[in-house]
């Protein structure tokens, strides 16, 4: 995974050259023919590639320009057409199709289950710490602290609904005001977008696939970050979310509703509850400063308990300690009062793997974290493989056209809004934005859905998760109804405001441009994806948290210069690209800065050195592990047994001369095999549905 060679004497135009094949439509670069833009700070260079060593001939030719890497790849059909098959072939193909569908649904099921278990694992590892974040008294006065707590807690428990429900219970108990809760909700919105970003990392094995998947996942992150960047200051200044939601809550006389329908959980719960069951009340109790809860385990042991509420007489030091004056008496020596006591009798143990192990939460969490990531990774690879074999030819064309085509003029603008509704509806059905966006990520990766279409679907998903929260709020008990409904509505209007900011006008769709930029960087320097994840979801929130604890003065003292530098850089960047003549010659580019400040190349060298020690060991594992380890170390030479690393090896073999392949391939399939795209063995058995 070393960076692409950069030629110092290349032409000023950063043209990209690629091999072509007879009859092949122009395709986006794939694993064997990847090209990448270098950092815009470096001298523009030409990217070139050689054919695989076994090709018949190569002709040095004028380089031909290749399509934008963001164009969807053409998923070619390599199989025998349906009409050309005999009856046996048709029957075989039909059952093959059914088998694939069953496998796809099976892997999808385990994919969703592994997401659920991943969330449980994160709660076991960081749940108690997350609860302690909430017990910080500064949240009330510092919205920035509230925001980062929302991010950190949601990242730690991998569930925005968990962090939101903690906030609701704290507001209901008057430990938190709605005003203080709003930034936490905004943070939870950001935190929940880490899940699909983690899922995107699993597609690291293929550069072009990873570029699209990572951009598709981070479009959610950027939307949330940008929305907070604009709306948090607006909310702090005007309290518009608090005011609007308060008016709505006060103007309606809500009656307690039904619980939000658990549609997906009904299917996944029977499996996930056999793995582990958690007592999520513990995190809430810690958040509400319950000392006893700190020593409780999150792993649920008893599933059937009998709770008996009785009133018992207890002695108290003085009449001042009595429950009420009328419930106070003496026996002549001691003062007594009556207390409501709940006796909990354990009846039946839970039926999950960890019930009798009595392991510490951290151990259970670590085991589940590793296993769920492996299952998640494995399922994702299999889903991508199955989809890759199914979505070919006309099937792919139909699906891609259906999903990515706009309505006819003049209603084209409506398509995106329909996608928002579809995203909201789908999320409402699966009851989780993480599940929906995570399922979307591999589809973006393999090129079924464009980022432009994924963006409104993701925005819809954000809305869908808030409608679920509103329904859940309506089902709350009387005392929590108002606060939970107001918080759910704050969440809803925050997302609506975000959509109004970053969707209606195409020019304002900044998240797409930012995600594509990050996708390009991450496709070239794959370690940067992990770096981004750590920086944005852990280091920045933790730094702000630490500075906030130190007090307002420290936060402002450090924050203001940092913000000032960022604004300065952005303004300079804008002037450089739009009107460089305004600037002095030195500032017209970034060359005045040392290389490490303007390029990732030196950092890449550092990372490569650092991971060098893993290179001989990291890749000789099964294909499932390969994607995870390729992400960890740029290892082109270390893994002959693993497809993804073989591809990398091939991709890096010779890169000196711009080449064009002669149009001598027998058919598309051979050409694609030569490019390492389809295993030769698959080509004969492939069947087309249409």
């Amino acid at each position: 995974m070393a960076p692409w060679p950069e030629l110092g004497d290349a032409q000023p135009n950063p043209d990209k050259y690629l091999e072509g094949a007879a009859g092949q439509q122009p395709t986006a670069p794939d694993k064997s023919k990847e090209t990448n833009k270098t950092d815009n700070t470096e001298a523009p260079v030409t990217k070139i590639e050689l054919l695989p060593s076994y090709s018949t001939a190569t002709l040095i030719d004028e380089p031909t320009e290749v399509d934008d890497p963001w164009n969807l790849p053409t998923l070619q059909d390599s199989g025998i057409k349906w009409s050309e098959r005999d009856t046996k072939g048709k029957i075989l193909c039909f059952f093959q199709g059914i088998g694939r569908l069953i496998l796809l649904l099976g892997f999808l099921y385990f994919f969703v289950c592994s997401l659920d278990i991943l969330s449980s694992a994160f709660q076991l590892v960081g749940g108690k710490m997350a609860g302690q974040f909430f017990s910080n008294s500064s949240i009330m006065s510092n919205p920035l602290l509230g925001l980062v707590i929302g991010v950190l807690v949601t990242v730690l428990v991998q569930s925005s609904s968990t962090s939101t429900s903690i906030v609701v219970s704290m507001v209901s108990s008057s430990l938190l005001t709605v005003r203080a809760a709003i930034p936490i909700i905004m943070g939870a919105n950001i935190g929940t977008s880490i899940t699909n970003t983690i899922v995107a990392l699993m597609q690291v094995g293929d550069r072009s696939e990873f570029r699209r998947a990572f951009a598709g996942a981070t479009v959610h992150d950027f939307f949330n970050w940008l929305s907070v960047l604009v709306l948090l200051p607006v909310e702090v200044a005007t309290h518009y979310l608090e005011i609007i939601t308060q008016l709505i809550v006060e103007s309606f006389h809500f009656k307690n509703g039904e619980d939000a329908p658990d549609l997906l959980k009904v299917i996944t719960k029977p499996f996930t509850k056999l793995i582990v069951q958690l007592d999520k009340k513990v995190i809430s109790q810690i958040a509400m400063n319950d000392e006893k809860a700190k020593n409780k385990s999150l792993v649920k042991i008893w599933c059937k308990t009998f709770t008996n509420k009785t009133q018992i007489n207890v002695t108290v030091p003085s009449t001042a300690n009595c429950t009420s004056p009328s419930l106070c008496w003496t026996d002549g020596i001691q003062n007594w009062t009556m207390k409501n006591v709940t006796y909990k009798e354990n009846i039946a143990k839970c039926q999950h793997i960890f019930v009798n192990f009595h392991l510490p939460d951290l151990a259970v969490g670590t085991i589940l974290l590793i296993l769920s990531l492996l299952v998640l990774c494995g399922c994702l690879i299999m889903i991508v493989k199955i989809l890759g074999s199914v979505l070919k030819g006309q099937v792919a064309t139909v699906i891609k056209k259906t999903i990515n085509t706009d309505f006819p003029f003049p209603f084209a603008w409506l398509t995106g809004y329909l996608a928002i509704l579809v995203g909201a509806g789908m999320t409402f059905i699966v009851q989780s934005s993480s599940v929906f966006t995570s399922a979307l990520t591999p589809l973006i990766g393999i090129g079924v859905i464009t980022i432009e279409r994924a963006y409104p679907l993701t925005l819809g998903s954000n809305i869908g998760t808030t409608t679920t929260a509103i329904l859940a709020a309506l089902a709350s008990p009387g005392n929590a109804l108002r606060s939970s409904l107001q918080i759910a509505l704050c969440h809803f209007f925050f997302n609506i405001s975000g959509i109004l900011l970053w969707y209606p006008i195409p020019f304002t769709r900044l998240p797409i441009r930012m995600a594509k930029g990050l996708g390009n960087i991450s496709a070239k320097y794959r370690w940067f994806a992990v770096f981004y994840l750590i920086i944005f979801f852990f280091l920045i929130p933790l730094t702000v948290f630490g500075l906030s604890l130190a007090g307002w003065r420290v936060l402002v003292g450090v924050g203001v210069p940092v913000v000032f530098i960022i604004i300065l850089v952005l303004c300079l960047r804008l002037l450089q690209s739009r009107c460089p003549r305004v600037l002095p010659k030195k500032l017209q580019n970034w060359n005045f800065l040392p290389l490490w400040m303007r390029s990732l190349k030196p950092w890449d060298a550092v990372v490569s050195k650092f991971t060098g020690c893993f290179q001989m060991r990291c890749c000789c594992c099964c294909r499932v592990c390969c994607r995870a380890c390729c992400l960890l170390c740029d290892c082109p030479k270390c893994c002959r047994c693993s497809k993804c690393c073989e591809d990398l090896e091939e991709a890096q073999e010779g890169q000196d001369v711009p080449v064009k392949a002669p149009e001598t391939f027998d058919n598309i399939t051979i050409s694609r095999e030569a490019q390492g795209e389809v295993p030769a063995s698959d080509s004969k058995t492939e069947c087309t549905a249409l």
Partner: antibody, heavy 119, light 107 residues
């Protein structure tokens, strides 16, 4: 059955002390408080104080504080009430009564001990 | 100290009559009130505690009611053995105090 048997009548001079005993049987001595109540001739009932034999903890009516001492002997299941600096108005029937567990109602009473203070 | 005032101080009634004795507390005592019956030359006997709970062995014609500051003892149908003096007692706070008593006589 629960029984509370008090010591016999006493005649005392003003300024003297009197010690009345109350021997209990029929229940666990250390679980219930023992109260002392007095009744002057033709008058109502007046609470003197109480003792918890299990720990020896006592509580006295402010009116008698400094003059009254209550003790318990767990080996004989007997409680004692000593009243010092006797005055003529201390002439009364002194009752020991078992307190019900957890509250101040008295369910079993001794037969009473008449203490007469006269010069 | 909490004062308890019983009324009436004297009460004449016949066998079979329904009799009500009231007890007023100077402050809220909740339901921490007991009623006793005392016959001449004898020790008091517990009838009611917690304002309404009959002690074991006490006939059902005796009943108590009230909470806070006003309490009543009712004898639904007077029997010859019921003619005695009745005391209310509060155990809401120390010192424990008794009412001055209500003497029930045969008419």
């Amino acid at each position: 059955q629960v029984q509370l048997v008090q010591s016999g009548a006493e005649v005392k001079k003003p300024g003297a002390s009197v010690k009345v005993s109350c021997k209990t049987s029929g229940y666990t001595f250390t679980t219930n408080n023992m109260h002392w109540v007095r009744q002057a001739p033709g008058q109502g009932l007046e609470w003197i104080g109480a003792i918890y034999p299990g720990s020896g903890a006592t509580a006295y009516n402010q009116k008698f504080k400094g003059r009254v001492t209550m003790t318990a002997d767990t080996s004989t299941s007997t409680v004692y009430m000593e009243l010092s600096s006797l005055r003529s108005e201390d002439t009364a029937v002194y009752y020991c009564a078992r307190g019900m567990y957890g509250h101040g109602a008295m369910d079993y009473w001794g037969q009473g001990t008449l203490v007469t203070v006269s010069s | 100290d909490i004062q308890l005032t019983q009324s009436p101080s004297f009460l004449s009634a016949s066998v079979g009559d329904r009799v009500t004795i009231t007890c007023k507390a100077s402050q809220d005592v909740g339901t921490a009130v007991a009623w006793y019956q005392q016959k001449p030359g004898k020790a008091p006997k517990l009838l009611i505690y917690w304002a309404t709970t009959r002690h074991s062995g006490v006939p059902s014609r005796f009943s108590g009611s009230g909470s806070g500051t006003e309490f009543t003892l009712t004898i639904s149908s007077l029997q010859p053995e019921d003619f005695a003096t009745y005391y209310c007692q509060q155990y809401s706070s120390n010192p424990l105090t008794f009412g001055q008593g209500t003497k029930l006589e045969i008419k």
